[in-house]
């Protein structure tokens, strides 16, 4: 009774198609699969960025897999062949591992890469990224930004740079069609007569870096002798009302009375007859139903009521 063995996949490699971090892992079937013609061979693939504690694990019948990686670090992957128990009249058989690594050979000392990279997707419409030049680089150093997301044929270079002292320190992106809810990859590289410049890679999803416009049309409505309803409207733009959280700051007679977070465009406030002045501001953020993270908008213009008569139906600024 001979022990059943299977070889690992052949030609296992990580291929970089130039998408700034979106890589292809590919392989060929193992040698000597003739004995298992009636069998569907599977592959167990494990991969990670070097330095990561955990492996991602995939079981597939395909000869390729694609995923995003942080190109600031190396990538390691391993794969083995799996013969399901149905093929072996017993337990599952696994081959030894085939292993491979990939990294971008760096150039330049780390200090030369861009510092404080910051990207904001304003009102879910306009992406703007800004950075500071690397430490100790001369004014002849220029940085270039490239980006890619699934749907683009190839990585594109920024065409509208923000400049300071002749250096590129940011990028205003064009309209980015169908670019949210998927990984958005950026590389900022550079050139200098003086010294080599280290490239930097960034990955994020646009819906997680949205900074909305502040709410508008703040109003007061008397609900009862001791209640006032504060109302506002969502700002113009593509973000639907269901995607907003709001933070309100209310001041009564120059004292902060309430800071509250609410999910809709109203807030009911208990008041006393002694109130001489009431002011509030509100700001918005994309909520957990539409993103994993977000940036608070600026505060709205302040809306105040002053005087004794709170019986007016609506008080506008």
């Amino acid at each position: 009774d001979t022990e059943i063995k299977v070889n690992p996949p052949q030609d296992f490699e990580i291929v970089d198609p130039g998408y700034l971090g979106y890589l292809y892992l590919q392989w060929q079937p193992p040698l000597s699969l003739d004995h298992f013609k009636e069998c569907t061979v599977e592959y167990e693939l494990k991969y990670r960025n070097i330095g990561s504690e955990t492996w991602k694990t995939i079981i597939t019948k395909n000869l390729h897999y694609k995923d995003g990686f942080d190109l600031n670090k190396g990538i390691e992957a391993k794969i083995h062949t799996l013969l399901p128990w149905q093929c072996t009249n017993g337990s599952e058989v696994q081959s030894s591992w085939a292993e491979t690594t990939y990294w971008i050979s760096p150039q330049g000392i780390p200090e030369t890469k861009v510092q404080d990279m910051d990207c904001v997707y304003y009102n879910w419409q306009y992406l703007l990224c800004s950075w500071k030049p690397g430490i100790g680089v001369l004014l002849d150093t220029n940085y270039n930004l490239f980006y890619w997301y699934e749907g683009l044929d190839h990585a594109l270079q920024c065409v509208d740079y923000i400049k300071a002292d002749g250096q590129n320190i940011g990028c205003r992106f064009p309209y980015l069609e169908a670019s949210d809810y998927k990984d958005f990859y950026i590389c900022v590289n550079g050139s200098s007569e003086n010294k080599p410049i280290r490239s930097s890679y960034f990955t994020f999803q646009l819906q997680n870096i949205v900074k909305p416009l502040p709410p508008v049309y703040l109003t007061f409505t008397r609900e009862s002798s001791c209640e006032i309803k504060l109302k506002w409207s969502i700002p113009l733009g593509p973000i639907p009302a269901r995607c907003f959280d709001y933070e309100i700051e209310i001041r009564e007679d120059d004292t902060t009375l309430v800071t509250a977070t609410v999910e809709n465009e109203t807030y009911t406030l208990k008041t006393t007859n002694e109130t001489r002045q009431l002011c509030f501001v509100v700001r918005s953020k994309v909520n957990i139903y539409c993103s994993d993270d977000g940036i608070w908008s600026e505060w709205s213009d302040k809306q105040c009521w002053e005087g004794e008569d709170l019986s007016k139906k609506t008080l506008l600024r």
Epitope: S105, P106, E111
Partner: antibody, heavy 116, light 108 residues
Framework: EVQLVESGGGLVQPGGSLRLSCAAS????????VHWVRQAPGKGLEWVGV???????DYNSALMSRFTISKDNAKNSLYLQMNSLRAEDTAVYYC??????????WGQGTLVTVSS | DIQMTQSPSSLSASVGDRVTITCTAS???????LHWYQQKPGSSPKLWIY???NLASGVPSRFSGSGSGTSYTLTISSLQPEDFATYYC?????????FGGGTKVEIK
Amino acid sequence: EVQLVESGGGLVQPGGSLRLSCAASGFSLTKYGVHWVRQAPGKGLEWVGVKWAGGSTDYNSALMSRFTISKDNAKNSLYLQMNSLRAEDTAVYYCARDHRDAMDYWGQGTLVTVSS
Amino acid sequence: DIQMTQSPSSLSASVGDRVTITCTASLSVSSTYLHWYQQKPGSSPKLWIYSTSNLASGVPSRFSGSGSGTSYTLTISSLQPEDFATYYCHQYHRSPLTFGGGTKVEIK
């Protein structure tokens, strides 16, 4: 097996020149950068410079005007051309492979003595 | 330039002792780019600890590293005869790359 072997050291007079070689095996200079680091007798380590895989170079600016790093990818070898040598350049010169922003393999070193 | 100051410059210790070497940078250094090398007389340096706390291949687990910003430490929990050597810290963050002056660990 990764190996780095330096050669070309020796005795040279002040003001003279010397060219050191570093023969690499077990990896390709098109994939890895290689540094030169020196160590004066009984002293600590001093970085000289690095030749990156892509061909660009970074130098210790204190030495840049007199020292030049080059490489020959076909021979998988790195070179350090040292001009206008001074007594304070007397040291063991090491080449070391760059890997993930550290120097993971070092050669055995070659001694350069600058003296009249 | 970033100056890397090691202390002590030398120390005498016995087998089994706990030994701590500190390295202070004149400017903040990312922990990713702070490494330690071991060098024995007549030999070239060896990468010993990389990125502050990761042991290089073959380095015994009695060695550990820690720190952040400007202050970093190499610790040997129980000194063994083969650990007697000189240890150098090294910053790979800013040009020029610099090394500490070394700490020589000698047998008491």
